[in-house]
Structure formats: C-alpha cells, structure tokens
C-alpha cells in the first residue's frame, strides 16, 4: 500500500479468483484513543471499533472511503484504491490502446517546436467518475524539471453507439535547450483514477521524435505569364523554432486532382516557393517537416488551383 | 577551414556535407521511428556517445560569440561516429548489405571531420569506448543505437552548419 | 426524503410533454438522479441521469428525444415529440451520493404517459 | 453495452433457494446493484456493489461475482419474495450503464 496523495491510498493487488489480497491496517488521525467506530462509504454498518481499523482488502467491495467517528462527529477519512495486477502485467482498463504508432500505446505526445512545450493526449470510453493527474521530468534518475497542467477534455466523439473521450495535457520543460542535442529522454506518468480503480500509464520521448511543426502559413498562388504554370509560396508556421535559419523546414508540394485517384504530383524544396502545373479543378498542398530530422510531416495547407 | 586558432570554416562546404550526412544517416536506419530502443537497456551502450549540449555554445547566440567550443563539439563527435562505424559493430557479422549507405556515411563523417580539423591541427578527440558486442543479434542492435544516436548529432550540426552559412559567411 | 414524479397524461403523438421530479429532505446539489422509464409489461430501461453538477447523459437510444434539467428542487425530463412507443410509466429516482455514475436508493411511486392518436 | 439476466422467470417453494444471474457484455468491476419490483410499485434497492446489502435487507438475499458475472441469491424463500429482480450496472454512463431484462420469482 503506499500513499497517492493526503488520505488517499493505493492497495496493489494481484487479481485472480480467489486470491488473498492485501491485509491493510487504518489509523484514525485523531488523539483521541477510545469510542472510536469506522464505516465504509455511506453505510452506516460498524466495521469496527478502536483506533486502528485491520481489513483484508481482495476487491473493489473492500475499497473505498474508511470513515472513523466518535459520537456522530467524523475524525478523519482514508479512501482506498485498487490497482490491479493481473499475470504479472498492471490493469490498462480505464484508456484506450491508441495502436499508433506501436500497440500499446495509451499516451500519444507532440511538440510544435523544440522550445520544450509539448502536448500529450489519451482516450478513453469513461464519462464520469474519472480523474487524471500528470507529472513530468527531463531523465527519471536524476530528473529536471518539467511542468504540466490539469488534463482537459479536449474531444468527443461518437464510435458507433459509443462515444469516445479525448483529454489533453499541455507540460513545458522549465529549463528547455532548443538547440542541444537531447540525451535524456522527457519522461510523463498519468495518474489515471475511476472509481476506485487506480492506473498509471507512462510515456518516454525525445522532444526530436515527436516533433509535428504547424502547417505553412500564408499559402499563395501566383500564375505566369503565357503559361500553365503558377507559382507557390509560402511562410513558415508562426509556431515554428527561430531562427529560421538554424531551425529549418524542408516542404513538400503536392498537386492533386478532384478524384483521390488521379496521379499525384509532389515536389520537395526547402525553399518556400516552387513551380508547379496547375491542373483544372485541381489544388496544392504544401505540408512542412524538420529539414534535418525525420520526425513528423506536418498537416497539409491547401488552395484551390482556381 | 576551422584551425585552432580562431579562423571560419567553410561554412558553406560544411553546410552541404552535413545536410547530406542527415540524409545517409536516416536512409541507413530509416524504421527509426518504429523501434523504441530506449527499451533496450540504452543507457550502458550509448551513455559514452559525445552530445551537443546546451552549454556547447551551438545555439544561434553561441555561434555568434565564439563558434570554436561549439566546433570542437562538432568535431569531436564526427571523430567519435567515425571510429565507431568503421569499428567491428559494423564490419562483424551480421554483414551490411553491399550497397548499405554506412559505407558513404563513414566516409562523409571523415570528410566533414577534415574540413573543421585539416592535417596538422589537432582537437582533443574523445576515447572511444570499448564496446565489443558478442553476439550478433547485440551487434544489429547496437547499430540501431549508435545510427539512432547519430541521426539526432548530425541534426544539430546541420542547424549549426546551415545557420553559420546563412550569418557567419563571409 | 422522497421524490415524487408529476406531468404524465394521455397525450397525442409529436405534443412535446415535460414530467417533473420533485424531490424534499436532500439537495440535488450532492446527489445524481435518474429517469427510468418500464413499458406495461415490460422491463425498466433507463433514459439519462443527471450527475451533482448538472451534466446530463443519456442512453444511446435517445438520440435527443428526451432532455433532463433541473432547478433547485426538482429535476424535469421533456419528451421533446412523443410516440406511441414511449408509453410508459416514467420513474424518478435518486442516487447513492457516492458517484456520478451511481446505484439508486430512493424512488419515486412513477408517472403515467399514454400516448395515443 | 448489454446486461443478459438468466432465467426470464424461476418458480420455487417457499423455504427454498433461487439464484439469478446477470451476465456483463464488458467488465464492470464490481459496479453492479439488484432491485426487487412488485406489481404497481416502483424498483427497491437490495444490493450495491455486487455484495453489499442495502439498508434494511435481509440477510436472506446475497450477491456475489465482479468482471462480467454476477449472482443473486434469495435463501429461505418467503412468499413475500414473489417479485421481478433487475440487476443495473453504474460502471459508466457512456460506457457501461442499465438494466437487465428482469427475472420474475414464482414462490409456490
């Protein structure tokens, strides 16, 4: 058993029929020493009596919130959580397998630029009764500091005839280096909480590999004389690491037809303009990726040929 | 050419080198993003590899006061990678593939090692250290790391590169 | 405490009709509360509930037929286009007070809703 | 999400046992509560949490299981037990939540 946070605690247990469970032992956090009763949750069943309170935790019937009282009056409260371990592997019940980029996969990261912000997302099929918290650091032997806030519910959204719930956390490492070359990876833990079922899922990650930049801004179109031609230009993303000329961009420029099926065209440039043919009713993207390191393409920016 | 002393490299030469050294480096371990070796017990097998850090002087405002500590760094990474790739983690068996690119990427790494440092000059180069995986299964993953490791060095001294040309040319 | 539901009558197909859940003895501000509803002769299916706070959620059925609201002292279920379908005897009920998502201790005697042309 | 309760209907003598089951479609924990219904009246409370009994239930009445199988059992069986019995789960309400389809006791 140990502590999540002031009077809050997590009994680890293997979970298999018949196991023995934990035997866990209460303390009223009182000085007084005699009529002391405790009962669980709302019912008003006496438990037991004295200071101490000793339980055989085996299932979620066994958790919840001790309450110890002294003639109707409450002397303090300690909620138990389950976390459950089952063939040796920790329960993932409350988030959704997100599968990309590998199985396994229940905390899904990204960055815009290398200043050391960087967001991170979960989904889950749980509307209520769910708490998360978020703790984060540069390296786990010696960590540095990194700060995150509260996860939000970000995104709904409807999978047949369930919904699906995305929540966020955005975290800032305190100490950032942008043009460092990282050694130690960031480290984030979700603490994930429903109804008295505890889980924690972790993720570890350089800020290089999950680096998604903006998509270009300002994207225009600029058609040549006599010509079926036009020029592309465009700008970097305003979210996008300066100076531009030591955090570089390369592009690439796609010409595509009305139907998904006709030919592609795509030219890379680390320019911010190109030449390209454009073609009736067809448009061009252009999308953005870190010119030196292979992390992710951003999203397309688009415009009609018209 | 950065001597010793003080005088500019050819920021410009350096810059292409180093966009192409990008480029091998990820044709040569491109399912990078698909293989968390971090799993793998990294720490004892990478730990030893040179890093840019933060106080390398390598950022924007450290190459416009003194671009030598940072080119140094560079250098003595470059050193580092290439005694490495040309060491028997990438000659021992399993064999690289006739046309893998380790084989430009060495040489690139040497390349632009001798354009910081040419003959004559010496900068304090870093021990390499002895690693002499067993089995070949280690060796493969070992290759990961070490182009893994090399991918987010050249990286950064591409910026450096690209960023010199673009401000610090004469 | 108790809850007692009000509102239901014959109606025809499509009249929109709001039932009311009146409750006494507890504050809906610490409690979720639930509409149920049992065809005659049927079973109990539930509609929605409404946590402490106010956040209705529904079953997946109800695709915007019904919506729940309260106030301080009651809480209101509207049939928004009744069918045919929906007669029932619609039940109020109150939660444990101990989830949003909760088991339901104290109900109402119900209210009856014929719809018919 | 679906909640399947076996047998539709059960007839047994008074002093006797019935047990009812109630199958999950997903694991619920141990988030699952039984109501007993007479004709006319509204569902009444007799268990939480799979096992726990309500206020004022007789001991006469037990439930037992967790994950996606769970069990009311009614011991010495009295006329007064002539009743439906709902099982509800409350492990969410988008991703687990409702009743099953009842199970009506004949007390002969």
């Known amino acids: 058993i140990w502590e999540l946070k002031k009077d809050v605690y997590v009994v680890e247990l293997d979970w298999y029929p018949d196991a023995p469970g934990e035997m866990v032992v209460l303390t009223c956090d009182t000085p007084e020493e005699d009529g002391i009763t405790w009962t669980l949750d709302q019912s008003s069943e006496v438990l037991g009596s004295g200071k101490t309170l000793t339980i055989q935790v085996k299932e979620f019937g066994d958790a919840g919130q001790y309450t110890c009282h002294k003639g109707g009056e409450v002397l303090s409260h300690s909620l138990l959580l389950l976390h459950k371990k089952e063939d040796g592997i920790w329960s993932t019940d409350i988030l959704k397998d997100q599968k990309e980029p590998k199985n396994k996969t229940f905390l899904r990261c990204e960055a815009k630029n290398y200043s050391g912000r960087f967001t991170c997302w979960w989904l889950t099929t749980i509307s209520t009764d769910l708490t998360f918290s978020v703790k984060s650091s540069r390296g786990s032997s010696d960590p540095q500091g990194v700060t995150c806030g509260a996860a939000t519910l970000s995104a709904e959204r409807v999978r047949g005839d369930n919904k699906e719930y995305e929540y966020s956390v955005e975290c800032q490492e305190d100490s950032a280096c942008p043009a460092a070359e990282e050694s130690l990876p960031i480290e984030v833990m979700v603490d994930a909480v429903h109804k008295l079922k505890y889980e924690n899922y972790t993720s570890s990650f350089f800020i290089r590999d999950i680096i998604k930049p903006d998509p270009p801004k300002n994207l225009q179109l600029k058609p040549l004389k006599n010509s079926r031609q036009v020029e592309v230009s465009w700008e970097y993303p305003d979210t996008w690491s300066t100076p531009h000329s030591y955090f570089s961009l390369t592009f690439c420029v796609q010409v595509q037809g009305k139907s998904k099926r006709e030919k592609k065209d795509r030219v890379f440039t680390d320019k911010t303009s190109a030449t390209v043919i454009c073609r009736k009713n067809a448009s061009i993207s252009v999308r953005a990726q870190d010119r030196y390191y292979s992390s992710s393409w951003s999203e397309w920016a688009s415009v009609p040929c018209s | 050419r950065a001597v010793p002393g003080g005088s500019s490299p050819a920021w410009t030469q350096c810059q292409q080198l180093s966009q192409k050294l990008c480029t091998l480096a990820w044709s040569a371990h491109p399912l990078v993003g698909h293989m968390d070796l971090r799993e793998e017990g990294d720490e004892e097998t990478t730990n030893d590899v040179p890093h840019i850090q933060c106080g390398d002087g390598c950022d924007p405002q450290g190459l416009r006061d003194n671009s030598q500590f940072c080119l140094q760094r560079i250098h003595q990474g470059l050193i580092f990678y290439e005694k490495l790739l040309g060491s028997d983690i990438f000659t021992g068996e399993p064999s690289l593939l006739p046309d893998s690119p380790v084989g430009q990427l060495h040489a690139s790494l040497l390349g632009l090692s001798q354009l910081l440092q040419p003959e004559g000059h010496h900068w304090e180069t870093q021990q390499i250290p002895s690693l002499s995986p067993s089995q070949p299964w280690q060796r493969l993953l070992l290759r990961f790391k070490i182009l893994r490791s090399l991918q987010a060095f050249v990286a950064v001294a591409a910026r450096v590169f690209a960023h010199g040309a673009a401000t610090l040319s004469p | 405490q108790s809850v007692e539901e009000s509102g239901g009558r014959l109606v025809t197909p499509g009249t929109p009709l709001t039932l009311t859940c009146t409750v006494s003895?507890?504050?809906?501000?610490?409690?979720?509360m639930i509409w149920v509803r049992q065809a005659p002769g049927e079973g109990l299916e539930w509609i929605g509930i409404?946590?402490?706070?106010?956040s209705a959620y529904y079953a997946s059925w109800v695709n915007g037929r019904f919506t729940i609201s309260k106030t301080s002292t009651t809480v209101d279920l509207k049939m928004t286009s009744p069918t045919t379908g929906d007669t029932a005897t619609y039940f109020c009920?109150?939660?444990?007070?101990?989830?949003?998502?909760?088991?339901?201790?104290?109900w109402g005697p119900g209210t009856l809703v014929t719809v018919s042309s | 999400f679906e909640l399947t309760q076996t047998p539709s209907s059960v007839e047994a003598a008074v002093g006797g046992t019935v047990t009812i089951k109630c199958q999950a479609s997903?694991?619920?924990?141990?988030?699952l509560a039984w109501y007993q219904q007479k004709p006319g009246q509204p569902p009444k409370l007799l268990i939480y949490?799979?096992?726990k009994l309500a206020t004022g239930v007789p001991s006469r009445f037990s439930g037992s299981g967790s994950g996606t199988q769970f069990t009311l059992t009614i011991s010495d069986l009295e006329c007064a037990d002539a009743a439906t019995y709902y099982c509800?789960?409350?492990?969410?309400?988008?991703?687990?939540?409702?009743f099953g389809g009842g199970t009506k006791v004949v007390v002969v």
């Open positions: 009920a109150r939660g444990s007070g101990t989830y949003t998502s909760d088991y339901f201790n104290i």
């Open positions: 003895g507890f504050s809906l501000s610490s409690y979720t």
């Open positions: 409404i946590s402490a706070g106010g």
């Open positions: 997903q694991s619920i924990d141990s988030w």
């Open positions: 949490s799979a096992s």
């Open positions: 509800q789960s409350y492990y969410d309400a988008n991703a687990g939540y409702g």
